[in-house]
Structure formats: structure tokens, C-alpha cells
């Protein structure tokens, strides 16, 4: 495959509500007009697909209705948000970018963003 550089932050800490956001940036070698973005999770040497979306430049980035991901695109950057995360979801989240159209096809895979998720402490009972 024709390789493409993809950059993403090394570490992100999820919010107390289990939401993590990060930017996935790709160095487009050509004039990309349709892009597919896939988020992969790597844990214990197993890789699973978290979510994926294909978008046309100038159009909104739409994931499936039941997806835990949302996102927006701007130029060669995709702002990804993953929600509903719990401590057990801590892991390496890899951004995979494919330039689908026009040809030629390009593929880029980032080094991954380590997302740390800490479950909030339950609120202590208050005496009022």
C-alpha cells in the first residue's frame, strides 16, 4: 500500500464522565476528497475495531447511530471523541486513515493514543 503519515497524541486522559477526545492528523500526499477513518483498540496484543466513518470533504463526519464515537473534520485533521468509557477500556487507541477517493488509495496508521480511564469514586453518603 502507498503509505501515509498519521499523527495522534501519545496520551489522553478521559474525563470523569468517560469521554476522551483526540486529534488524528494525516499528511495527504494527494488531493483527498473521500476519507475513511477507523479507530482501533489494541489491548493485550489484540486489536478490535471501535468505530469507523467515511466522509466526503466538506461533509460532516457521521458514525453509525449506535457508535460510541463522534467526530468532526477540518482539512487534514479529524477530531475524534469516544464516549461511554470505563476503566476497563483503558488501552491504546489507534487511528487508521484511508484515502478512498480519488485514486490512488493510500493507507496511514498512527502510533496510537494511550487513553487512560479512571472510574469515578462513588459519592459518599451525606448526612443532612
Amino acid at each position: 500500500c502507498k503509505a501515509m503519515h498519521v499523527a495522534q497524541p501519545a496520551v489522553v486522559l478521559a474525563s470523569s464522565r468517560g469521554i476522551a477526545s483526540f486529534v488524528c492528523e494525516y499528511a495527504s500526499p494527494g488531493k483527498a476528497t473521500e476519507v475513511r477513518v477507523t479507530v482501533l483498540r489494541q489491548a493485550d496484543s489484540q486489536v478490535t475495531e471501535v468505530c469507523a466513518a467515511t466522509y466526503m470533504m466538506g461533509n460532516e463526519l457521521t458514525f453509525l447511530d449506535d457508535s460510541i464515537c463522534t467526530g468532526t473534520s477540518s482539512g487534514n485533521q479529524v477530531n475524534l471523541t469516544i464516549q461511554g468509557l470505563r476503566a476497563m477500556d483503558t488501552g491504546l487507541y489507534i487511528c487508521k486513515v484511508e484515502l478512498m477517493y480519488p485514486p490512488p488509495y493510500y493507507l496511514g496508521i498512527g502510533n496510537g493514543t494511550q487513553i487512560y480511564v479512571i472510574d469515578p469514586e462513588p459519592c459518599p453518603d451525606s448526612d443532612f
Epitope: 500500500c1 466526503m56 470533504m57 466538506g58 478512498m100 477517493y101 480519488p102 485514486p103 490512488p104 488509495y105
Partner: antibody, heavy 120, light 112 residues
Framework: EVQLRQSGPELVKPGTSVKISCKAS????????INWVKQNHGKSLEWIGD????????NSNQKFEGKATLTVDKSSSTAYMELRSLTSEDSAVYYC?????????????WGQGTSVTVSS | DIVMTQAAFSNPVTLGTSASISCRSS???????????LYWYLQKPGQSPQLLIY???NLASGVPDRFSSSGSGTDFTLRISRVEAEDVGVYYC?????????FGAGTKLELK
């Protein structure tokens, strides 16, 4: 039902320009690229270029740069191609066609074609 | 540009028999992603072209399974198992491995 309806035949003089239209219906216009293809009468097909209806971004065949200009009007779900400095070599049938990502960007629906005849 | 080469005419075929149409590309259309960027279109007399096959061997919606396609990276064959009168027309192979998209000159299917 998906349809691409093209404007009618054109008889134009050498050196002039012509603008042909392709009105889309039956699907969300901004979800698919529109391609333009030239067919010299009874001959093969030549790809002219494509346009992204969202932002008007185009990809084109170098052979047609300076000859064809592709535009869209999102409000009317219509794609346009303007051909300028016409010569007899431009006499042909021109098709618009929709690209479908599920078919790996094949042209799955075509307009009925617009015949352009350049003659003095 | 990638050149797609086709014979102008097929061998005349009898209704109900099989027909083969060949196409050759000047460069392999098999990408390292495993996809072969080869397409077949049919233009019936007086009509616009219509998509038959995408990604070398996949039938587009509504295309009868009498049609099939196979090939290597550069040599491709479209087969029609039982030719019907409505199959008459010009068959074009095309590539979209790279820009510009290119078509073959077309092969006319003729009946005996």
C-alpha cells in the same frame, strides 16, 4: 428512484462556449461525487473529471484542463459542465454519472447524455 | 495513463450459448490492499452505459448472474453464460486504480 436528467442537445458555433446541466433526484445530492464522461459519436468513453457536491472540489483529466469547468448548485441538486473555445473535436455526447462508494467508486447511475455539435 | 485494450468485436455468438470478452491493462490493477480496480460497463444501442461489474468480479445490483468476471492483475475476462438478445451492445472495461480514470475502446457483442 435515482435519476440524473441532463439538458437537451446543443448546436453551437466554433470558438463559443456551452454549459450543460445534470439534475439529480432520488438521493441525497451531497452524498455522491458526480463524474463527467465524453463519448465521441459511436466511439469510446473518456473521463473528463469529477466534482464533490459539498465543496465544489474537483479532480480532472489533464487532457480537459482549460476546456471543461465543473460546478454544482447544491440548492437545486444540479451539476454543470461548461466547455469553452469549442472546436469540431468537442462534438460528442457528454454524460454525467454518479459515483457509488459501495461499488468502490464505480459509476452506478448515468444521465441520458447531452449531444453537443460544434458547427459553423 | 493506464491503457485499457479490448478487441473491437467479439466472436459472433448464438442465443443461449456462452460468450467471453477480454480486456488487458497496461499496468496491474491489483492493489496491495487486495482490491482489483477493474470495472465492466455495458452500453446497449441508443442507451447510456450501465454498470455491470465492480472490483473485477462483483455484480452490481440488478445484474443477472449469467454475468461473471475474472482475471489476473492485467488480463481480464467477462463471461456471459447464456446470451440473451438484451445482452447485445458494447462492453467497456475501465480502471480506477489511478487518475485519470480510463476505459477500453469497447467490444461489440454480436449475434450469429
Amino acid at each position: 428512484e435515482v435519476q440524473l436528467r441532463q439538458s437537451g442537445p446543443e448546436l453551437v458555433k466554433p470558438g463559443t462556449s456551452v454549459k450543460i446541466s445534470c439534475k439529480a433526484s432520488g438521493y441525497k445530492f451531497t452524498d455522491h461525487f458526480i463524474n463527467w464522461v465524453k463519448q465521441n459519436h459511436g466511439k469510446s468513453l473518456e473521463w473528463i473529471g469529477d466534482i464533490n457536491p459539498n465543496n465544489g472540489g474537483t479532480n480532472s483529466n489533464q487532457k480537459f484542463e482549460g476546456k471543461a469547468t465543473l460546478t454544482v448548485d447544491k440548492s437545486s441538486s444540479t451539476a454543470y459542465m461548461e466547455l469553452r473555445s469549442l472546436t469540431s473535436e468537442d462534438s460528442a455526447v457528454y454524460y454525467c454519472a454518479r459515483l457509488r462508494r459501495e461499488y468502490f467508486y464505480a459509476m452506478d447511475y448515468w444521465g441520458q447524455g447531452t449531444s453537443v455539435t460544434v458547427s459553423s | 495513463d493506464i491503457v485499457m485494450t479490448q478487441a473491437a468485436f467479439s466472436n459472433p455468438v448464438t442465443l443461449g450459448t456462452s460468450a467471453s470478452i477480454s480486456c488487458r491493462s497496461s499496468k496491474s490493477l491489483l492493489h496491495s490492499n487486495g482490491i482489483t480496480y477493474l470495472y465492466w460497463y455495458l452500453q446497449k444501442p441508443g442507451q447510456s452505459p450501465q454498470l455491470l461489474i465492480y472490483q473485477m468480479s462483483n455484480l452490481a445490483s440488478g445484474v443477472p448472474d449469467r454475468f461473471s468476471s475474472s482475471g489476473s492483475g492485467t488480463d481480464f475476462t467477462l463471461r456471459i453464460s447464456r446470451v440473451e438478445a438484451e445482452d447485445v451492445g458494447v462492453y467497456y472495461c475501465a480502471q480506477n486504480l489511478e487518475l485519470p480514470l480510463t476505459f477500453g475502446a469497447g467490444t461489440k457483442l454480436e449475434l450469429k
